[in-house]
């Protein structure tokens, strides 16, 4: 090269260098029909109209108006590598995937690394937790890990996704991102402190991709060849060392590289540094989870790590870049319900929801079909069923094969020792309030034990500096959950809050203006 | 009840010291931060230190490094040690609890101080 600068500002240039001996492809339009001229329209003179009938121009342009797909409803910003899963030590007692099936044994993986509130253009380096979603392509169909950087989330009961993701997005008049929401949100549902703690810590702010820790975060169930069953969690801890962004560095790489995150994942595996993470389970057994002082299903706690040890299983390794960012990222698709046997749901209520809500949304963003696009088709199995045609429908659609069942002519058989780990449940069917589960035991452990003096300082400083632009009533019912936790916690950020609140001028009220004939009398008295 | 009381004010000269005193009582002390507001004549109340259960302290920036605030977790008492007095603080000092909110009115009956010459 020339010019050698990372291989991400020289990819074209490598590119063209690989292909050095090869002639210049011919171009052609998307049927494959060669084009003579691609720099000028036909047209009726030098100077007239267009003809309909300049299909190199319709063609392209027609393509061109249908790039865009619907971005991600959450997790829109994201970093994609691919590597494989390798078995270091033996869970065959706990769980039969094959993916677990003996040490030593490679599975293919494909991992995405994204943001959650931002648009698909927003930059790497802010404030928000990060997806870290891993797919093995195992013989009994693709495994979807979809964790995050960090062990709990800010809500227990899926009900809530929806209205907390429109807090942490734009206000629906302004389109601005508003504190008011976010916060509001936050103060009313005090079950979201411990992720709001972690997030505002210096772990809010990883340094790239490579230098976070991943986790499933739900309680998920593994059962053995004997049909034995207990609960597990996943964990996947970075080789490569925690390392974090500061607020300041964080602030000014997110103008100078908004995509520096991106950036650092392809340049670190282009120069042959292959990120590596160590994966873990914890093992709950039904009857320790009988006797747990907490729910534990409960996505805003974690188990405690002296109680219920780390068990190493294996390595996570990304070894190379994606061939193409639209193929092989934005259209890959994630979801916890594709789990082979020997790996099940538990009762976790947000696990519950996510069975439902990945596939869905996968549906309407990339279509029926998107199973068939190849970085999420399970390869490494042999697929086999009663689903037949819709859109894009890329392979041979199964051929003649029956699209019944049941069916007397040798068309796929169910396999009984797939069927799901049998469990008896009884109690009422109603609407569960968990508002109050104890919302703060957890987070006082993690302000108290895990953070140091310095961390605890910083924890308060990061809250206090997004927290005061939101209006002081607000205000007020998050600094007394934060005081719950621990009266230092709130206090601390109160301090800090009354320094910005007495140097900056507040407004006081939010304008919300509704067309008179939808207001109330006594709204309307009030106006 | 809720009950704030200020003491330890006075006149001193320029550049001279003084150290005011908050007693508190009716809530639970050591949960909440405490602060220090003033009002001179004929303007609003000034916020001018708080500080955290555990003795983290801010300072608005016409104090910082004259003033200083403490806590006495265990006798319920706020203390703000003032050196290097100028005329303009001249005011009546509150104590308070809870959030600083501009345009509130004083918790408690304050305590007067005068820098003069």
């Known amino acids: 090269m020339a010019d050698s600068r990372d291989p991400a500002s020289d990819q074209m240039q490598h590119w063209k260098e690989q292909r050095a001996a090869q002639k210049a492809d011919v171009l052609t339009t998307g049927a494959g029909n060669p084009v003579g001229d691609k720099l000028n329209v036909i047209t009726v003179g030098p100077r007239g109209p267009l003809l309909v009938q300049d299909v190199v121009f319709t063609d392209e342009m027609a393509h061109f108006d249908r790039e865009r797909i619907p971005e991600r409803v959450v997790h829109a910003k994201g970093a994609g590598a691919f590597g494989y899963f390798e078995v270091t030590h033996d869970i065959t007692k706990y769980s039969k995937a094959k993916v677990f099936e003996h040490i030593g044994k490679k599975t293919p993986i494909a991992v995405r690394f994204s943001t959650v509130a931002g648009e698909s253009g927003s930059a790497d380096t802010v404030r928000d937790p990060r997806g870290f979603a891993v797919k093995f392509y195992t013989e009994d169909g693709n495994w979807d890990l979809v964790g995050n950087n960090t062990p709990i989330f800010f809500i227990r009961d899926p009900i809530l996704f929806p209205s907390f993701i429109h807090s942490q997005k734009r206000n629906p008049q302004t389109h601005l991102k508003d504190p008011d929401m976010v916060w509001d949100f936050w103060s009313l549902r005090p079950e979201s402190l411990h992720q709001v703690s972690f997030l505002f810590s210096d772990r809010g702010i990883p340094d790239g991709h490579r230098h976070m820790n991943g986790y499933g975060s739900h309680t998920f169930k593994l059962v053995n060849a004997n049909g034995e069953a207990v609960y597990c969690k996943f964990h996947y801890k970075t080789d490569q060392g925690i390392k974090n962004l500061s607020v300041e560095d964080a602030a000014r790489l997110s103008q100078e590289d908004p995509d520096y995150g991106i950036r650092d994942l392809f340049n670190a595996i282009a120069t042959g540094k292959y990120p590596s993470w160590t994966f873990y389970i914890q093992v709950m057994t039904f009857n320790q989870a009988e006797t747990f002082p907490f729910n534990p299903f409960d996505l805003t706690k974690v188990w405690p790590h002296k109680d219920y040890p780390l068990i190493p299983v294996g390595k996570l390794v990304l070894n190379r870049n994606p061939v193409n960012y639209f193929a092989e990222v934005e259209q890959i698709a994630f979801d916890p319900s594709n789990m082979p046997p020997g790996i099940e749901a538990s009762p976790d209520k947000m696990l519950q929801g996510r069975l439902f809500a990945y596939p869905d949304t996968h549906r309407h963003r990339l279509g029926p079909n998107y199973l068939h696009i190849p970085v999420n088709c399970p390869y490494r199995a042999r697929v086999a069923n009663y689903q037949r045609d819709g859109p894009m429908c890329m392979q041979d659609n199964q051929g003649g094969a029956p699209n019944y069942y049941p069916n007397s002519f040798g068309a796929p058989e169910q396999q009984p020792s797939a069927l799901e780990h049998s469990i008896q449940y009884s109690g009422e069917v109603r609407r569960f309030n968990t508002a109050n589960d104890d919302n703060v035991t957890q987070v006082r452990a993690f302000y108290v034990n895990v953070l140091n003096e310095e961390q605890r300082k910083r924890l308060c400083e990061n809250i206090a500096g997004h927290l005061k632009d939101a209006q002081i009533f607000i205000q007020k019912k998050a600094v007394k959950n934060f005081t719950e936790v621990h009266p230092d916690y709130g206090s601390h950020i109160q301090a800090l809050l009354d320094k910005y609140n007495a140097e900056k001028p507040k407004n006081a009220i939010h304008t919300f203006v509704q067309s008179g004939s939808h207001l109330a009398a006594r709204e309307k008295a009030n106006l | 009840e809720v009950q704030l009381v200020e003491s330890g004010g006075g006149l001193v000269q320029p550049g001279g010291s003084l150290r005011l005193s908050c007693a508190v009582s009716g809530f639970i002390f050591n949960t909440y931060s405490m602060r220090w507001g003033r009002q001179a004549p004929g303007k609003g109340l000034e916020w001018v230190s708080s500080?955290?259960?555990?003795?983290?302290?801010t300072y608005a920036d016409s104090v910082k490094g004259r003033f200083t605030i403490s806590r006495d977790n265990a006798k319920n008492l706020v203390y703000l040690q003032m050196n290097s007095l100028k005329p303009e603080d001249t005011a009546v000092y509150y104590c308070g609890w809870g959030a600083f909110v501009r345009g509130e009115r004083p918790q408690g009956q304050g305590t007067q101080v005068t820098v003069s010459s």
């Open positions: 500080i955290s259960t555990g003795g983290y302290s």
